[in-house]
């Protein structure tokens, strides 16, 4: 590849570098669907943005293949815990790929926050943070799931969120 | 913009890329002021550094606009709690901008760590981590606040810290 | 340095940029040695990879000096807590350098997860996440330690992991 080609590549790289893919999506009232699907996110208002990534039904969609640091935080809380609720909350980032029919676990955390509330009227708060580097191909998607999502507390987009950037 | 201009830009970009803004500030004895202000940080000693960002009264100050991954961890701990199990800790990253008189919440976490003290021992430890991508303009500042800061434990700069890097 | 030299440097930089150092290592059955050493990690299978970093006996080994965002998550859990176990778990990232005989603490977290299990037969889960930017020289190593590692739960590489990327 001659000087001209290299030059074009560098120009291209500079431009693409200017838009190194990144996104930060925030929790909203509509995030919790109760349908068993992934959490949904705000993509434009307030602190939320998409740059070189797209969004579809709760998923960050990769447009440029590479290694991404993906992260999510969820704010948990309640007054006591729902009767019969298993004492474990699972918060995870999962990959959807056209090459495989099921979601693939990427980063997962399990917590037992309800042990902190020993009576049914006790208010408690807890938080779960996940972050790590994964390889994503163009077209692959990443979603956030929380089981049991009844314990996720949403307010203003600062306490529960989901993001990624290419490294 | 002709070849020469592009060349200069690329050279410039290479140089600026060498100093991609980043910082890691560490907790110190002077971090907790008790004044209601943000936490203060060590900027030079040990693991602390500033590269392409500056510091002022607890705040990381942005010199180059862009998207930044900002993060903070605080080590929480105590012997009992001032409000018992009802004690809530709020740990947050907040933005100060010349364009708005009040601090803006960026990333926030609430925890009820005091339930971690067992009946046989009043001693407990907990940790809160926040991280996420936000857009910051030149001159804007980011600070860390913890309410109730009496529950923050400082020791050697490895347990409570605050940092950022451009993505 | 003339145009040709600059050109070569830019070409070089583009290539090195393509391999910006990054790694994500995952927990495996062999991670917990019980020997008092650091945790060991999977480097190739599943989600694990090394790019511009190497691995040796639990350690990420730096080949290119610079500032790195390093991170680790460990999944904690148990049924009650081991008799006589101090209620504190320490999870940390530590640096090994040829210039100093002892490991240096980089990022550390202490938690008291066992307070969440109110009876000796109660199942509990907790998670600890650490992440921050540190400067690492070529040849320096970073390891993860957890005390008491009996409380680390491994399953499939998604719950306990260790990674880094250059910023």
């Amino acid at each position: 590849d001659g000087p001209a080609g290299s030059w074009e590549q560098l120009i291209q790289e500079r431009r693409s570098h200017e838009v190194n893919p990144a996104a930060h999506l925030t929790g909203a009232n509509s995030s919790l669907t109760g349908s068993g699907g992934p959490l949904l996110w705000e993509t434009q208002l307030g602190l939320a943005f998409l740059r070189g990534l797209s969004y579809h039904d709760g998923a960050l969609v990769v447009t440029k293949a590479g290694y991404y640091y993906i992260y999510s935080k969820v704010q948990l809380g309640g007054v006591g815990c729902p009767l019969g609720l298993a004492s474990t909350i699972t918060h995870g980032l999962y990959k959807r790929t056209p090459r495989y029919p099921e979601e693939l676990e990427l980063l997962v955390s399990q917590q037992s926050p309800c042990g902190r509330a020993t009576s049914s009227s006790r208010v408690w708060w807890d938080s779960s943070f996940l972050g790590g580097v994964v390889h994503l191909e163009a077209g692959e998607e990443v979603v956030v799931r929380v089981l049991d999502e009844r314990l996720v507390r949403l307010r203003d987009g600062t306490r529960s969120y989901f993001g990624a950037f290419m490294v | 913009d002709g070849p020469a201009g592009s060349w200069e830009q690329l050279i410039q970009e290479r140089r600026s890329h060498e100093v991609n803004p980043a910082a890691h500030l560490t907790g110190a004895n002077s971090s907790l002021t008790g004044s209601g202000g943000p936490l203060l940080w060590e900027t030079q000693l040990g693991l602390a550094f500033l590269r392409g960002l500056s510091y002022h009264d607890g705040a990381l100050v942005v010199t180059k606009a862009g998207y930044y991954y900002i993060y903070s961890k605080v080590q929480l701990g105590g012997v009992g709690c001032p409000l018992g199990l009802a004690s809530t800790i709020t740990h947050g990253l907040y933005k100060r901008t010349p364009r708005y008189p009040e601090e803006l919440e960026l990333l926030v976490s609430q925890q009820s760590p005091c339930g971690r003290a067992t009946s046989s021992s009043r001693v407990w430890w907990d940790s809160s981590f926040l991280g996420g991508v936000v857009h910051l303009e030149a001159g804007e500042e980011v600070v860390v606040r913890v309410l109730d800061e009496r529950l923050v434990r400082l020791r050697d700069g490895t347990r409570s810290y605050f940092g950022a890097f451009m993505v | 340095d003339g145009p040709a030299g600059s050109w070569e440097q830019l070409i070089q930089e583009r290539r090195s940029h393509e391999v910006n150092p990054a790694a994500h290592l995952t927990g495996a059955n062999s991670s917990l040695t019980g020997s008092g050493g650091p945790l060991l990690w999977e480097t190739q299978l599943g989600l694990a990879f090394l790019r511009g970093l190497s691995y040796h006996d639990g350690a990420l080994v730096v080949t290119k000096a610079g500032y790195y965002y390093i991170y680790s998550k460990v999944q904690l859990g148990g049924v009650g807590c081991p008799l006589g176990l101090a209620s504190t778990i320490t999870h940390g990232l530590y640096k090994r350098t040829p210039r100093y005989p002892e490991e240096l603490e980089l990022l550390v977290s202490q938690q008291s997860p066992c307070g969440r299990a109110t009876s000796s037969s109660r199942v509990w889960w907790d998670s600890s996440f650490l992440g921050g930017v540190v400067h690492l020289e070529a040849g320096e190593e970073v390891v993860v330690r957890v005390l008491d590692e009996r409380l680390v739960r491994l399953r499939d590489g998604t719950r306990s992991y260790f990674g880094a990327f250059m910023v």
């Epitope: - | 701990g77 012997v79 001032p82 018992g84 009802a86 009946s119 | -």
Partner: antibody, heavy 119, light 111 residues
Framework: QVQLVQSGAEVKKPGASVKVSCKAS????????MNWVRKAPGQGLEWMGR????????NYNQKFMGRATFTVDRSTSTVYMELSSLRSEDTAVYYC????????????WGQGTLVTVSS | DIVMTQSPDSLAVSLGERATINCKAS??????????MNWYQQKPGQPPKLLIY???NLESGVPDRFSGSGSGTDFTLTISSLQAEDVAVYYC?????????FGQGTKVEIK
């Protein structure tokens, strides 16, 4: 200024119960723990337990578990200590002591309430 | 329970002289570099008064002739120059673990 004012002296028969009040003023009542401590004649100080006015949560010294009950009335900024199944060795001065800002010491005390248990 | 043992049981010191009271805990009362040890003064007919918290911190309004030191299991209360109004019983108290426990008290008198 901070004040803790306790109810007056009581004389009770063995097996009876006594309820001592401690009314707080001069500070934000719910922000501080309230402890109960007693001093029997010729004895040292003995911690009975604490109550968190914000929630009503209580912690008791095992020695008094089942006999002591701490309650709070936030509307009047008053905490109460009730001790049941009284015996002669419960004869003592009972104090309420406010938890300090750093909550693991008692920085203000009530004047004390003498409870005499006698048949 | 953590047992707190004070020595001596009583102490007679001349006005203006130093008075030293020791307190030994049956186990460490330290946590993360802080000692959960307090000292109180009690005069006849009065409630206890906080003098020192966290082993060495002087409570607001307490004269600076009072000082505290120590860590782990061994602690000391010092009155650098005894005054007549210092005649009282002094108690140490641990707050690292429930139940909070006090020493048996040290009676300080004028010689």
């Amino acid at each position: 200024q901070v004040q803790l004012v306790q109810s007056g002296a009581e004389v009770k028969k063995p097996g009876a119960s006594v309820k001592v009040s401690c009314k707080a003023s001069g500070y934000t009542f719910i922000d501080h723990i309230m402890n109960w401590v007693r001093k029997a004649p010729g004895q040292g100080l003995e911690w009975m337990g604490r109550i968190y006015p914000v929630s009503g949560e209580t912690n008791y010294n095992q020695k008094f578990m089942g006999r002591a009950t701490f309650t709070v009335d936030r509307s009047t900024s008053t905490v109460y200590m009730e001790l049941s199944s009284l015996r002669s060795e419960d004869t003592a001065v009972y104090y309420c002591g406010r938890g300090s800002y750093y909550w693991n010491a008692m920085d203000y005390w009530g004047q004390g309430t003498l409870v005499t248990v006698s048949s | 329970d953590i047992v707190m043992t004070q020595s001596p049981d009583s102490l007679a010191v001349s006005l203006g002289e130093r008075a030293t009271i020791n307190c030994k805990a049956s186990q460490s009362v330290d946590f993360d570099g802080d000692s959960y040890m307090n000292w109180y003064q009690q005069k006849p007919g009065q409630p206890p008064k906080l003098l020192i918290y966290s082993a060495s911190n002087l409570e607001s309004g307490v004269p600076d002739r009072f000082s505290g030191s120590g860590s782990g299991t061994d602690f000391t209360l010092t009155i650098s120059s005894l005054q007549a109004e210092d005649v009282a019983v002094y108690y140490c108290q641990q707050s690292i673990e429930d139940p909070w426990t006090f020493g048996q008290g040290t009676k300080v008198e004028i010689k």
